[in-house]
């Protein structure tokens, strides 16, 4: 393919005389001839077939090799059959010799034959007879030879005639190169083929404008000795904001984006976002819409949710249960959670302050996924405001006013605190006498104490209770030689306090005498 060849010499392209050096001058002569298409061209011919021992040299002008290493010489020639020339058998030949001589510069008009290196003896595949001439059969022979690798700046070609009747119709000298191409968005420059027939020249490509090398896969190709690019390795890909169009990367249009070089095509901006310039790698959010740090560029811009709906409450002394419905607008996100803001407000001016850290929230104060919460350990007879805010992944990015549902309540009387200092006063076979101290914070008048007890190995599956108004009690009707667990709590009008820590007591083993003590006032079956 001609496109792979870089011409250094083409005798057919020259319209004027070639003026090569002929030695002796009576040997090769420059004439006007015809090529295979009968187009007039400058040719050299020799037909010194009468005398033996012919040694006619024809030398080209100096040929600069450029950056070539392997040179190709294509000869087109016509050779006359010796049989068509009467009386020349023995002196007529049907071959000629091809030589070259490397130099760094033009050495002048002298042909120093001994410096020339023989490339080959050239013979015709077909010569023509006089009859062929009459039928105008131009039997043109084409022979290609290689020379190289060459080390100097240029060279001469020489043709030695040894007694043939021959016309050099065309001398073409060229080297092969792989012409610059764009493959996989990488530009591979013009590359001269290697010095050996089998050599491959590895060439690294340069990414086209607005493209980048694929990770750890830089573009490479191999230029073969025949001037052909072999299978590409690696590739370039269009950068963020650009997409491939043929051998180039074009910017994404307005309202389109491409966030990563790994994406193939530009995409239309997601909902509630825009790009007002070409080559965008991401789309900006419209006013009031946001993108969370964890949101990929391809998701729509979103906004904070509206306030929760239908907030209701239930007060049990100093515990408040809150419940609500989801917001009407989740802002376009499905990561809605809730947070509770508790404020304690004064009776006078209605000024409110945050509740502080001694308040309990079940299951938690923030990041609530369910739409209910229980707020505990509030002060009795106090005013509180609870704000319930719906929150999503972009709420913290918004500078607009918070949207929440609020409720104001007043707590009732608080239940007493935990009973402390439980002691076993007396332990018998079937009864145990206990005493304890009043709660540190009765939060009102203690109306009674409730004692819960059960056999330890029953693990509270079945328990009994006993109520008493004093800070001591005797629990009867127990089994001898059995370990019992006891817990006590105080009761006021506001409700039950928390049970005291467990106390383990073992009754005495069975004996002959029986003691009659106070019997348990109540015994209830209460499975855990």
């Amino acid at each position: 393919q001609a496109a792979k060849e870089v011409l250094l010499l083409d005798s057919k392209a020259q319209q004027t005389e070639l003026e090569w050096i002929s030695s002796p001058p009576s040997g090769w002569e420059e004439i006007s001839g015809l090529d295979e298409n009968y187009t007039p061209i400058r040719t050299y011919q020799v037909c010194q077939v009468m005398e033996p021992n012919q040694n006619n040299w024809l030398r080209t002008n100096w040929i600069s090799k450029g950056n070539a290493q392997r040179i190709f010489v294509e000869l087109k020639f016509t050779l006359r059959d010796c049989n068509s020339l009467p009386g020349v058998l023995g002196t007529c030949k049907e071959t000629f010799n091809l030589y070259y001589y490397e130099t760094d510069y033009d050495t002048g008009r002298n042909i120093r034959e001994n410096l020339y290196v023989k490339i080959d003896t050239i013979a015709a595949d077909e010569s023509f007879t006089q009859g062929d001439l009459g039928e105008r059969k131009m039997k043109l022979n084409t022979e290609v030879r290689e020379i190289g690798p060459l080390s100097k700046k240029g060279f001469y070609l020489a043709f030695q005639d040894v007694g043939a009747c021959i016309a050099l119709v065309s001398v073409k000298v060229y080297y092969k190169k792989c012409w610059s191409i764009v493959e996989n968005l990488a530009v591979f420059p013009d590359t001269v083929t290697g010095s050996e027939f089998s050599s491959l020249v590895e060439v690294r490509g340069t990414c086209v404008s607005s493209a980048e090398e694929e990770a750890e896969n830089s573009p490479r190709m191999h230029c073969s000795a025949e001037g052909e690019w072999l299978v590409p390795i690696g590739k370039c890909i269009c950068k963020a904001g650009y997409q491939q169009k043929g051998d180039t990367c074009e910017p994404c249009g307005r309202r389109f984006y491409k966030s990563s070089s790994q994406d193939l095509q530009c995409s239309r901006c997601p909902t509630h976002s825009f790009s007002d310039r070409e080559g965008s790698s991401r789309c900006e959010c419209e006013d009031g819409y946001y993108r969370a740090p964890s949101d990929p560029p391809y998701v729509a811009c979103t906004r904070p949710p509206s306030a929760p709906q239908n907030l209701i409450f239930n007060i049990n002394q100093t515990t408040v249960s809150l419940e609500w419905s989801p917001p009407a607008d989740n802002g376009g996100r499905n990561d809605v959670t809730y947070r509770i803001l508790c404020k304690r407000c004064s009776w006078e001016q209605g000024e409110c302050v945050p509740c502080g850290s001694n308040i309990g929230y079940m299951p938690q104060q923030t990041g609530l996924e369910d739409n209910y919460v229980t707020v505990m350990d509030l002060l009795a007879h106090a005013n509180y405001t609870f704000e319930v805010e719906a929150v999503n992944g972009v709420s913290d990015l918004s500078r607009s006013q918070r949207l929440f549902a609020a409720v104001s309540i007043t707590t009732g009387q608080a239940a007493p605190s935990q009973v402390s200092g439980v002691m076993k006063e007396r332990v018998l076979q079937r009864s145990v006498q206990l005493s304890w101290q009043e709660p540190e914070h009765p939060n009102g008048v203690i109306t009674e104490y409730e004692i819960k007890y059960y056999e330890k190995d029953q693990r509270e599956r079945t328990y009994s209770t006993l109520k008493t108004k004093s800070t001591s009690a005797s629990i009867n009707n127990l089994k001898p030689g059995t370990v019992y667990v006891f817990q006590i709590r105080a009761v006021t009008a506001a409700g039950y306090g928390n049970y005291s820590p467990r106390l383990d007591v073992a009754t005495l083993e069975e004996a002959s005498g029986k003691m009659f003590e106070a019997t348990a006032v109540s015994s209830e079956q209460n499975p855990v």
């Epitope: 009576s26 009386g87 021959i166």
Partner: antibody, heavy 121, light 106 residues
Framework: QVQLLQSGAEVKKPGASVKVPCKAS????????MSWVRQAPGQGLEWMGW????????TYAQGFTGRFVFSLDTSVSTAYLQISSLKAEDTAVYYC??????????????WGQGTLVTVSS | EIVLTQSPATLSVSPGERATLSCRAS??????PAWYQQKPGQAPRLLIY???TRATGIPDRFSASGSGTDFTLTISRVEPEDFAVYYC????????FGQGTKVEIK
Amino acid sequence: QVQLLQSGAEVKKPGASVKVPCKASGYTFTSRAMSWVRQAPGQGLEWMGWINTNTGNPTYAQGFTGRFVFSLDTSVSTAYLQISSLKAEDTAVYYCARVRLTVYGDGMDVWGQGTLVTVSS
Amino acid sequence: EIVLTQSPATLSVSPGERATLSCRASQSVSSNPAWYQQKPGQAPRLLIYGLSTRATGIPDRFSASGSGTDFTLTISRVEPEDFAVYYCQQYGPSWTFGQGTKVEIK
């Protein structure tokens, strides 16, 4: 300069012989074949044949075999045409001409001035 | 043997005019015949040989063309010194001449 010099006119009786010389100068005699051409009075040209000046090998055209002989003396760069048993119809101007061989065709590029041979009783 | 027939036998032209001489072969011959010019009392002179190559010193008003069996010698503008007899000659194992065309002043 390249030239071929032939001898002057010859008058011969029928049955006699004549030897026409052609002396070459200005080039290497043995590098080119020599052709002989006959032109009868008022007639066209007739090619008689040629001789390889290197080997002495002659080629004769039809009608010019037997009585016609081409020969050489390379030492003096001279070609000869000898005609024996002359006949009246042999009366003509005889030209020697240097042969121009090329790949694409041949011709005679240098001619002698011609020698008129008259055969008359 | 190949016979070459030239026509016309005589061609009358004025100086400056174009002259076209024909040479027809009895069978297909060499790519182009050689052409000679002969003036009275002179030896023939080679004009054209090979593939329409002009011999040394021949002006470019002389050109030859043709193929197969029909060949032409053209004198683009006839000069006074061009009035002569012109012969075509085919080459090969045996050479033959045409009978000639005389170009004379009109």
